[in-house]
């Protein structure tokens, strides 16, 4: 009976998603494999997060708006070890936008979804961000790594979107 | 204020490559922006052909992929459209235009534009 | 690609009368629609970007509005400087796409 209710209720909320996500990839979790994880097919899975790279070339603000039309956001870096998983699936030849902007060139770096703008986790290319005009970050692969680099906002570019998991 | 100035041949045999060049003067094409080529065939239909970016990075318009090279001269603030086994479908008025203006919302600054007609 | 497709392909309007273009895109743009004019042997003007801005400068007459994939162009009270060839073109992904363009004639 109780696995009866489990059943249903997960079918709810499958049916709720539906609307947003036509097809979704859940994978079991938990101590007791009770729990599902979900993400949008075909983005990929890491830890709580979704990630799906957008090959579209846009602008810095049409990025995250075309991110958020996917109730996601611009990715929020928070590791070496997210950046590294992200960067598997990346295009060494193309530059990806992030979540990271600084809107008045003042150098105050800001994450698209408030977490606080850590220097001691920034994987900035050596002599990087280098200009006040260049008020966006981008990832890009260069001397042998892949690493943040300041860009134009207006210039476009490709773009990694990160959302929650979603629980079922 | 930035100007754009397009220059070259205007009249190519077919099979051959089309080469034109744009001087942009009052902005340096380093600083910011992307520089695009845009033609406008004789039915008046426009077309984006693709751009080089103020960081020297390119993106080209797929119909054109295997055909296209745009480059540059910073030095002399310049930036070229090379366009290779031209035929007559290609026979356009091109324009060199700035990308990137009102947020990426609009192309406001263009050349006046160079008639080139592809004709045995 | 997003495709643009723009009506009427021509239209004859008179001094003083007011006239719709319309541009409709093959998806949704999110606003991101310019609108142009062109005189002849001269180069296209922006007017209008995120489908409702006017540039500096252009006469209040004009208003662009729409959403989604529908928008349109309207000139009020037509002046003989408003005569000439209209184009959209959408601001969204690479390519950015034009519309044919709508040839305003002086009836």
């Known amino acids: 009976n109780f696995m009866y209710s489990k059943t249903v209720k997960r079918l709810s909320k499958l049916q709720e998603y539906q609307q947003y996500y036509p097809s979704l990839t859940c994978v079991m979790e938990g101590k007791d494999m009770e729990d599902w994880s979900c993400c949008p097919t075909p983005w990929t899975s890491f830890q709580s997060s979704c990630y799906f790279i957008s090959t579209v070339m846009q602008s810095w603000t049409k990025s995250q708006n075309n991110c958020s039309v996917m109730g996601a956001d611009l990715v929020v870096i928070n590791t070496k070890e997210e950046q590294d998983f992200i960067t598997q699936n990346l295009k060494i030849n193309s530059a990806y936008f992030l979540g990271l902007s600084d809107p008045k060139g003042w150098r105050h770096w800001q994450w698209v979804d408030q977490t606080p703008y850590n220097k001691n986790v920034t994987f900035w290319h050596s002599g990087e961000p280098n200009s006040p005009d260049e008020r966006c970050a981008i990832i890009n692969f260069r001397s042998e790594e892949w690493g943040w680099n300041d860009v134009h906002c207006h210039v476009p570019q490709k773009s990694i979107c990160k959302m929650k998991k979603i629980y079922i | 204020d930035v100007q754009l100035q397009e220059s070259g041949p205007g009249l190519v045999k077919p099979s051959q490559s089309l080469s034109l060049t744009c001087s942009v003067t009052g902005y340096s094409i380093t600083s910011a922006y992307y520089w695009n080529w845009v033609r406008q065939f004789p039915g008046n239909q426009l077309e984006c052909m693709g751009y080089?970016?103020?960081?020297?990075?390119?993106n080209y318009n797929p119909s054109l992929k295997n055909r296209i090279s745009i480059t540059r001269d910073t030095s002399k603030n310049q930036f070229f459209l090379k366009l290779n086994s031209v035929t007559t479908e290609d026979t356009a008025t091109y324009y060199c235009v700035r990308g990137g203006d009102y947020d990426d919302g609009g192309f406001a600054y263009w050349g006046q534009g160079t008639l080139v007609t592809v004709s045995a | 690609d997003i495709q643009m497709t723009q009506s009427p392909a021509s239209l004859s309007a008179s001094v003083g009368e007011t006239v719709t273009i319309t541009c409709r895109a093959s998806?949704?743009?999110?606003?991101?629609l310019a609108w142009y004019q062109q005189k002849q042997g001269k180069s296209p003007q922006l007017l209008v970007y995120n489908a409702k801005t006017l540039v500096d400068g252009v006469p209040s007459r004009f208003s662009g509005s729409g959403s989604g994939t529908e928008y349109s162009l309207k000139i009020n009270s037509l002046q003989p400087e408003d005569f000439g060839i209209y184009f959209c073109q959408h601001f969204w992904i690479i390519p950015y796409t034009f519309g044919g363009g709508t040839k305003l004639e002086i009836r």
């Open positions: 998806g949704n743009i999110h606003n991101y």
């Open positions: 080089i970016t103020y960081d020297g990075s390119n």
